[in-house]
């Protein structure tokens, strides 16, 4: 309940999670259909199957070959016409696509599950968090998070710790040591710099986030765990 | 005459070439823009190969806000009066929390803080109303009949609600609906 520095003015972006997984599965990209059409046109332009035999025959009948400059101009003219049509089509199509749910800026799009985090996870400052309700040992928690394609909760800074502490109960974090003679390390093997309370107790070799501070605990005890996935 | 014709065709070819090039570059720019604007990332489902697009702003909340189930929430750490809280939320183009159901904030059901929410008593309608004017469902807070109508409501995400003086200072939750 103590007053803390307001963070109201520092607003920028964290993603909303719910809308993942509701997207039609087939398309890799929402514009694939249209873009395939556009690219089809472009590909056709790269190898224009313009049948010049007819033209050649006319010239042959007259006993004359057309100057190459004229042929080039004709080909370029046709390419110009096709390109012009493609450009116009594209100009018309893009706003149409945007109006029809394909744009991330439309309200309809926002109803979808966007893909930042799995459903029922929360997003905060470019990370996804799984808020666990079940209790596990530290090792079981580590495995549970791995199976969710994420890591056991890590604390990157004081601000994140304050935020998490305000909404979560005690939770395992991804920090441990082999014994009280060894340094605290993260699950990535990096040295952990922050102070961990009760580090002098040889039986307590796994770390817990507990209301605004970090403390050591018995790795075999059961605690709630949370997972984190950086975006 | 033949030379003149050749020169003319060359001129036409050159002009058409330039037009073609400019059309090609226009098309390229249009396509690039359409790609950037329209691409939507694949769903992040718990599974082996997760590909995340960092730069997409789709369904995103402001920094320091929490995204959950199509909504953005600002969970304050500072304590304010009910009116101050309401104005702070409004200044962020949001409103004090309006609950759809008691498990809406189940991601923070372990929190033991009470937060101001956007519920106040309307003498005119003789009912507890949310900020958008809709009435409080009698199923949301079974104890709401005992609330003092002069007070404002502080809510704990565990489902508890208290009526307290609107001049009291509590933390607060702002909400932005993305749909």
């Amino acid at each position: 309940m103590n007053k803390q520095r307001g963070t109201f003015s520092e607003v920028s972006l964290a993603q909303d999670p719910k809308r993942q997984q509701r997207k039609p599965k087939g398309n890799k990209s929402s514009i694939s259909g249209t873009e395939q059409e556009i690219f089809q046109v472009e590909l056709n332009l790269q190898n224009p199957s313009l049948n010049h035999q007819g033209i050649d025959k006319i010239y042959d009948c007259q006993g004359l070959l057309p100057p190459p400059e004229k042929l080039t101009a004709e080909v370029l003219g046709i390419i110009c016409i096709v390109l012009m049509a493609t450009v116009l089509k594209t100009i018309v199509l893009i706003p149409f696509l945007e109006q029809n749910n394909f744009s991330p800026n439309t309200r309809t799009q926002k109803a979808r599950h966007c893909g930042h985090c799995p459903e029922e996870w929360i997003t905060y400052s470019n990370s996804c968090y799984y808020i666990g309700k079940e209790r596990r040992t530290w090792e079981e928690s580590l495995l549970a998070c791995t199976s969710k394609n994420s890591s056991l909760l890590s604390i990157d800074n004081e601000e994140e710790m304050k935020f998490l502490a305000s909404i979560l109960p005690s939770s395992w974090i991804g920090v441990f040591r082999n014994s009280s003679h060894h340094p605290w390390v993260t699950i990535n093997g990096l040295a952990f710099k922050h102070k961990i309370k009760d580090s002098d107790n040889a039986e307590l070799n796994c770390a817990v986030l507990q209301v605004n501070r970090l403390k050591s605990a018995q790795c075999g005890s059961s605690m709630i765990y949370h997972c984190k996935h950086k975006l | 005459m033949a030379v003149f014709k050749t020169t003319l065709w060359r001129l036409i070819s050159g002009t058409l070439g330039i037009i073609c090039l400019s059309l090609m570059s226009t098309l390229g720019i249009l396509l690039k823009n359409s790609f950037t604007k329209l691409s939507i990332e694949p769903a992040f489902t718990p599974g082996p190969n997760i590909e995340l697009q960092k730069d997409s702003d789709c369904c995103s909340c402001q920094e320091k806000w929490v995204g959950y189930r199509c909504n953005c929430y600002f969970i304050s750490s500072e304590q304010k009066t009910w009116n101050e809280s309401r104005h702070l939320c409004a200044s962020q183009k949001s409103s004090l929390l309006q609950l759809q159901n008691t498990d809406e904030l189940d991601f923070m059901s372990s929190s033991q803080q009470f937060y101001w929410i956007g519920l106040s008593y309307s003498e005119e309608h003789t009912a507890w109303l949310w900020e958008n004017g809709s009435a409080l469902s009698q199923y949301l807070f079974p104890s709401f009949e005992t609330f003092n109508t002069k007070n404002c409501i502080a809510y704990n995400p565990n489902g508890n609600a208290l009526d307290e003086s609107c001049e009291d200072k509590n933390r607060y939750i702002c909400k932005q609906q993305l749909i």
Epitope: M1, N2, K3, P169, S170, V211, M223 | Q79, T81, S109, S110, Q112, Q113, F114, N151, N158, N160, L162, E164, S165, C166, E167, D168, K169
Partner: antibody, heavy 120, light 107 residues
Framework: EVQLLESGGDLVQPGGSLRLSCAAS????????MHWVRQAPGKGLEWVST????????YYADSVKGRFTLSRDNSKNTLYLQMNSLRAEDTAVYYC?????????????WGQGTLVTVSS | DIQMTQTPSSVSASVGDRVTITCRAS??????LAWYQQKPGKAPKLLIY???SLQSGVPSRFSGSGSGTDFTLTISSLQPEDFATYYC?????????FGQGTKLEIK
């Protein structure tokens, strides 16, 4: 360092009145709810009353409702408990306690207590 | 009102023992529970809050667990200074209520 110092405890006759004070220091007083808890001689702890940080809302145990009034003066960092219509069963050591920052329903710092004796 | 029942009401133990005190709520209180230690003539001291969070400055031999209606305070290895009376308290709703206390005595 958080300090809570109660005063005002005394021997009073049934039906009489007493005003207890609790002077707080070492923390930002107006950020926290405050409580009174009492303990009858040789008995357990009993919650008496709670006041919110700005003093706008008070909560009372049924046993004291209508007789006790809790207030605070944030400018003086002081908590008051006005006790009227005192009864023999109000005899106890009265502790003033600070609310925990994690949740106001926990009492993280206590005063040393002041003894109120109601007897004829 | 929520009733809090502590068991046992008293327990005798020796230094180095592991001691467990239980507290039961008459209705679910999630994890809104605290444990206090009180020595004769002194004010109570907060040990555990939110069922399992250790209050700052409290030795790690004290731990709390439980949720809903059943809660436990454990002292892993009893020290001479731990002989006192222990109370549980629910903070889920007004009126806040305490257990009747468990007196921990030297065997």
């Amino acid at each position: 360092e958080v300090q809570l110092l109660e005063s005002g405890g005394d021997l009073v006759q049934p039906g009489g009145s007493l005003r207890l004070s609790c002077a707080a220091s070492g923390f930002t007083f107006d950020n926290y709810a405050m409580h009174w808890v009492r303990q009858a001689p040789g008995k357990g702890l009993e919650w008496v009353s709670t006041i919110t940080n700005s003093g706008g809302t008070t909560y009372y145990a049924d046993s004291v409702k209508g007789r006790f009034t809790l207030s605070r003066d944030n400018s003086k960092n002081t908590l008051y408990l006005q006790m009227n219509s005192l009864r023999a069963e109000d005899t106890a050591v009265y502790y003033c306690a600070k609310a925990h920052y994690y949740a106001r329903g926990y009492f993280d710092f206590w005063g040393q207590g002041t003894l109120v004796t109601v007897s004829s | 009102d929520i009733q809090m029942t502590q068991t046992p009401s008293s327990v005798s133990a020796s230094v180095g023992d592991r001691v467990t005190i239980t507290c039961r709520a008459s209705q679910g209180i999630s994890s809104w529970l605290a444990w206090y230690q009180q020595k004769p003539g002194k004010a109570p001291k907060l040990l555990i809050y939110a069922a399992s969070s250790l209050q700052s400055g409290v030795p790690s031999r004290f731990s709390g667990s439980g949720s809903g209606t059943d809660f436990t305070l454990t002292i892993s290895s009893l020290q001479p200074e731990d002989f006192a009376t222990y109370y549980c308290q629910q903070a889920n709703s007004f009126p806040y209520t305490f257990g009747q206390g468990t007196k921990l005595e030297i065997k």
